[in-house]
């Protein structure tokens, strides 16, 4: 089926991975489709097979090299096409001239750890993963803390408008279990979006000292 609503979205992780999602209403689950990448100034071509992730969407990763290798730059253009098999031939279902540094989505931050915890505050640090050195300090972060009895969606967002890989959470309740997540976004790129949220870090504040005001 080709008359359904289609969407083709790809992001570059700033190092060696382009991740793509192709969705099409009314498409058959067993349709064989792939993403083909044709760079304008590189010697390689790359293809990945689109695999189903839901009823009407497929995803794949174009792995361009070792995870931390810088495979594309701000001047690269990669023509990306969705090709689906129709009988004996491949049909172009979507096409774009992909500018990697206009379409960034970094990997989720990793290595979250509690640096110091008290009754009312907690200092947490993290690291960014597979992020290009091109960004220098031009990154921002969002963080959120899950309190007891609340959902992640209810958690207020804390914005860090600079490359700061730590946060000091204040006004916490003593002897209480919390969870914390962080995500990162480069300042560069018209279609750039937030990374996925990090894996949650669970921590517990210290109990208040007996006989003292809290």
């Amino acid at each position: 089926a080709v008359n359904g609503t289609s969407q083709f979205t790809c992001f570059y992780n700033s190092r060696a991975n382009i991740s793509c999602v192709w969705s099409q209403d009314g498409a058959l689950q067993d349709t064989s489709c792939q993403v083909h990448a044709w760079p304008d100034r590189r010697r390689w071509n790359q293809t990945c097979e689109l695999l189903p992730v839901s009823q009407a969407s497929w995803a794949c990763n174009l792995i361009l090299g070792a995870p931390d290798s810088q495979k594309l730059t701000t001047v690269d253009i990669v023509t990306l096409r969705v090709l689906c098999r129709e009988g004996v031939r491949w049909r172009v279902m979507a096409i774009q001239d992909f500018k990697p540094f206009e379409n960034l989505r970094l990997m989720a931050p990793i290595s979250l750890q509690v640096v110091h915890v008290e009754t009312h505050r907690c200092n947490i640090s993290w690291e960014i993963s597979q992020a290009s050195h091109y960004f220098e300090r031009h990154l921002e972060f969002e963080a959120r803390t899950l309190s007891p009895g609340h959902t992640w969606e209810e958690a207020p967002l804390l914005t860090l408008k600079q490359k700061q890989e730590w946060i000091c959470l204040e006004t916490l309740t003593p002897d209480t279990q919390y969870e914390f997540q962080v995500r990162v976004k480069p300042l560069q790129g018209e279609f750039t979006t937030w990374s996925p949220w990090s894996q949650p870090l669970a921590f517990r504040t210290k109990p208040a000292a007996l006989g003292k005001d809290t």
């Epitope: 289609s6 023509t79 279902m93 774009q96 001239d97 500018k99 018209e190 279609f191």
Partner: nanobody, 126 residues
């Protein structure tokens, strides 16, 4: 704000040629796919041709394939349509259109545009 302004239309004899231009402003031109569509008198909009942001991919309606060429000059923020071997049935108002993203979908190329210019009249007649 996004602005698209077509030019180059006119009266031409069958078999003749004409070149249309579309000057774009108000957006990062080379980040977006573009297209040409046309509307003949008393008819609906008909998709003519599409081009990717860097001009590396192009598609054409069967009715114009081999006669029309779409191109773009990103340094000048301008989209072009070179029309050769014109026929009376090419008579229409020609519009340039901006897609809402860098992607277009060849099976349904008329879908996904968000801005269109005021158009330029092309008349093919002897």
């Amino acid at each position: 704000q996004v602005q698209l302004v077509e030019s180059g239309g006119g009266l031409v004899q069958p078999g003749g040629s004409l070149g249309l231009s579309c000057a774009a402003s108000g957006f990062t031109f080379d980040n977006y796919a573009m297209s040409w569509v046309r509307q003949a008198p008393g008819k609906g909009l008909e998709w003519v041709s599409s081009i990717t942001g860097a001009g590396r991919g192009t598609h054409y309606a069967d009715s114009v394939k081999g006669r029309f060429t779409i191109s773009r000059d990103n340094a000048k923020n301008t989209l072009y349509l070179q029309m050769n071997s014109l026929k009376p049935e090419d008579t229409a108002v020609y519009y340039c259109a901006k897609y809402s993203s860098s992607t277009y979908y060849p099976p349904t190329p008329a879908r996904g545009t968000d801005y269109r210019g005021p158009g330029t009249q092309v008349t093919v007649s002897s």
